[in-house]
């Protein structure tokens, strides 16, 4: 009898530990529901007054026809540029025409004045060739002026109205490119 | 947060071709960026391809070419075809989400927990 009374007693200790696991998952499910919900409701808020405001760039991006450009605030490598450019949902700046540049070095006039930015461009160690980070050739007209003589990975910048050359490793403003939200209107 | 589960790492030859697979979960809608990332041993982790939320694409100069990053948006997944592949290719690669809380105003990266490719013969 005493066996049976502790067989019962260990079944019904084994379903509380089944309902406490389940009430746990439950409470976890709805703080996970709650906190997508918060995630839902800032990105329709984003979205929305994005929406309202029609900007085709974000705050402190300029447009100029289907791109938007950001003239970054700080220095950086190479490298670092480019990572920052990413976690902004932007590449690096890849300069497509003469109208695109004479755009670029015009903004930044009226912005910095003359100083080196970091653009999506390097040189290939082995063939010496110059390629966009999106694996394209520059068009003849957009090859850096000079060859630096570094011994180290070689990247391009913009500086007044050149696009030159220098050590990926030195420190310099850079300008990232994403695309221009299009107007539903 | 996000999750990322990464496929499709192992043993080829030189020469031959291998197709990296990265699939996020969680909250996708706040990433800007997915790419693949490297590291061999003794060297430091280095950016191998990236796209970014609007299709814009990154490669390192050693990958130009060789390399080619894409994504299926329906499954929320980011591929990584590596052909002609090198011995210097080998290294533990790793799918990389760069995403923003719109909640605190911040932006992270998310990692996986990264797949073994070796190019020997």
């Known amino acids: 009898k005493l066996l049976q009374v502790s067989t019962i007693a260990m079944q019904q200790q084994e379903k509380l530990i089944q309902q406490e696991r389940a009430l746990l998952n439950f409470t976890e499910w709805k703080r996970s529901c709650a906190l997508q919900m918060k995630y839902c409701q800032a990105f329709m808020q984003n979205s929305l007054s994005s929406a309202h405001n029609s900007s085709p760039c974000p705050n402190n991006w300029i447009q100029n026809r289907e791109s938007c450009y950001y003239v970054s605030e700080i220095w950086s490598i190479w490298h670092t540029s480019q990572e920052n450019c990413l976690k902004e949902g932007s590449t690096l700046l890849q300069i497509e025409s003469k109208e695109e540049m004479d755009f670029i070095t015009g903004s930044l006039r009226k912005i910095k004045g003359s100083y080196d930015y970091w653009v999506g461009l390097s040189q290939d160690g082995h063939s010496g060739r110059w390629l966009w980070q999106d694996g394209s050739s520059p068009s003849p007209g957009l090859l850096p002026a000079e060859r630096s003589q570094s011994a180290n990975q070689v990247c391009g910048y913009v500086k007044s109205n050149s696009l030159l050359s220098s050590n990926c490793s030195t420190w310099k403003y850079f300008i990232c490119e994403k695309y221009a939200l299009r107007s539903s209107v | 947060q996000v999750q990322l589960q990464e496929s499709g790492g192992g043993l080829v030859q030189p020469g031959g071709s291998l197709r990296l697979s990265c699939a996020a979960s969680?909250?996708?809608?706040?990433?800007?960026?997915m790419g693949w990332y490297r590291q061999a041993p003794g060297k430091q982790r280095e950016l191998v391809a990236a796209?970014?939320?609007?299709?814009?694409?990154t490669y390192a100069d050693s990958v130009k070419g060789r390399f080619t990053i894409s994504r299926d948006n329906a499954k929320n997944t980011v591929f990584l075809q590596m052909d002609s592949l090198k011995p210097e290719d080998t290294a533990v690669y790793y799918c990389n989400a760069k995403w923003y809380d719109p909640l605190v105003i911040e932006y992270y990266d998310n990692w996986g927990q990264g797949t073994q490719v070796t190019v020997s013969s």
């Open positions: 969680g909250s996708i809608f706040s990433i800007n960026a």
């Open positions: 796209i970014t939320n609007q299709g814009r694409l």
